[in-house]
Interface confidence: medium
Amino acid sequence: ESLGTEQRVVGRAAEVPGPEPGQQEQLVFGSGDAVELSCPPPGGGPMGPTVWVKDGTGLVPSERVLVGPQRLQVLNASHEDSGAYSCRQRLTQRVLCHFSVRVTDAPSSGDDEDGEDEAEDTGVDTGAPYWTRPERMDKKLLAVPAANTVRFRCPAAGNPTPSISWLKNGREFRGEHRIGGIKLRHQQWSLVMESVVPSDRGNYTCVVENKFGSIRQTYTLDVLERSPHRPILQAGLPANQTAVLGSDVEFHCKVYSDAQPHIQWLKHVEVNGSKVGPDGTPYVTVLKTAGANTTDKELEVLSLHNVTFEDAGEYTCLAGNSIGFSHHSAWLVVLPAEEELVEADEAGSVYAG
């Protein structure tokens, strides 16, 4: 099974024009890797024509060097591809993004974007720990609905291979500190918490260290409590319909509900000339309801075939769950057959649907 190289691009737009050297992205690739740099427009606005520059010289596109307005790819990288890369506005030469790229002789461990560098002492570049994808670590706040799974990762490298430990709110964090425990994967530089609850809120810090130094990253977790609610029906559905006698009609109803919803289609009827009962409740007949072999998807559509004038009237989609009920209604108007509508059609006043 032969697989391709990852096409996630790395890098980010500099926050300010002409970033200081300390603000440049420092990226390490292995020999033979595809160097991929991305420079989205600052603030998401239009970027205009750009040029990619390496060590002060404009890059010429080739089969190996693929240049785009916001992205640069250098395929089959070698040591000679190491250097200072920047993306500049063509007209002003303003530096939008700056990258320091180092291509090591040893092939990289692969998909650093996952942070799963093989933790091996290669004998190359002995030194302090560093983030393998620093540009991916800008986002520090994670807001998660309760009961979901959370994973924090601190993809790092160094030689000797660094160790990783985790703190919660500045204190050592261990499995016994939370119901359900935690899962630590040192090879993945990861901390996993399943089925999070409000008490899991806080600051989570990874500490990555070896004998040459230590780096740390803090993530903030906010757990959002789900407030139970009755089903939500999509606005505008079902929609009023005008149909020609003998045609087919479909009413649609889109239901959103955390708790399992029960969906019914009702048609409003008259009893002894009245549309409502003594208590004000409308008279209805149930056209469609959940059965043993009915899916929610099927219940969200009411199909009427070969409609007659008796089918005209008000239809309601009723959805309920353990919290309560919601309903939306729509009207069906049935018009005479096509040939009786010629004059009206020509006047543009009737649309047979």
Epitope: L3, D111, E113, D114, V150, R151, F152, Q188
Partner: antibody, heavy 127, light 110 residues
Framework: EVQLLESGGGLVQPGGSLRLSCAAS????????MSWVRQAPGKGLEWVSG????????YYADSVKGRFTISRDNSKNTLYLQMNSLRAEDTAVYYC????????????????????WGQGTLVTVSS | QSVLTQPPSASGTPGQRVTISCSGS????????VNWYQQLPGTAPKLLIY???NRPSGVPDRFSGSKSGTSASLAISGLRSEDEADYYC???????????FGGGTKLTVL
Amino acid sequence: EVQLLESGGGLVQPGGSLRLSCAASGFTFSSYYMSWVRQAPGKGLEWVSGIYPDDGSIYYADSVKGRFTISRDNSKNTLYLQMNSLRAEDTAVYYCAKDPLIYELPIGYSSYGMDVWGQGTLVTVSS
Amino acid sequence: QSVLTQPPSASGTPGQRVTISCSGSSSNIGSNDVNWYQQLPGTAPKLLIYYDSNRPSGVPDRFSGSKSGTSASLAISGLRSEDEADYYCAAWDSSLSGYVFGGGTKLTVL
């Protein structure tokens, strides 16, 4: 009900093209990593391609790179696979699949497995 | 040749315990989550185990997953006739930047 429904398969000559679609329903499509996986007749599963929710990251197997293009339209809840320069060895049932939602930082591939699969669509490449 | 290596076949009698192995390397099983899939004849695959040893809701606890180093295994206890299927291990491969499957193991319930 969470569902994936593939379409677009059929018989095509070598060198020809096909576009597969996968219509998603019952979940917030725009939040999920989606994949295409294929299975040649009588053979095992082979991952073909994957795409992040924000369309910022795409992966391909070497066997299809340069010939297949994965894309998604979050407004239509649809995943696509454009297949060009088709070969006999591309003959397979093509499945689309979604990954479960894992919240993580840094945002990245979760590898939590494909928890929902479509029923598959058969692509036959033959002259 | 698959990146992950599984035995092509396995068998057992009803009630028995059967284990299916999956061997990989440091760039896949060694550093990423292992998933197991069950494919019943004529149907789409179904996720059986995720994150090495977790079962999605609806999967019986007769199925269990484990991992050690660069190898993983799927154990099925109390074997039933309906367990007869193809089983695939899978994982993300960091050096290939792709999702890799094992060749599959055909389980026969005798």
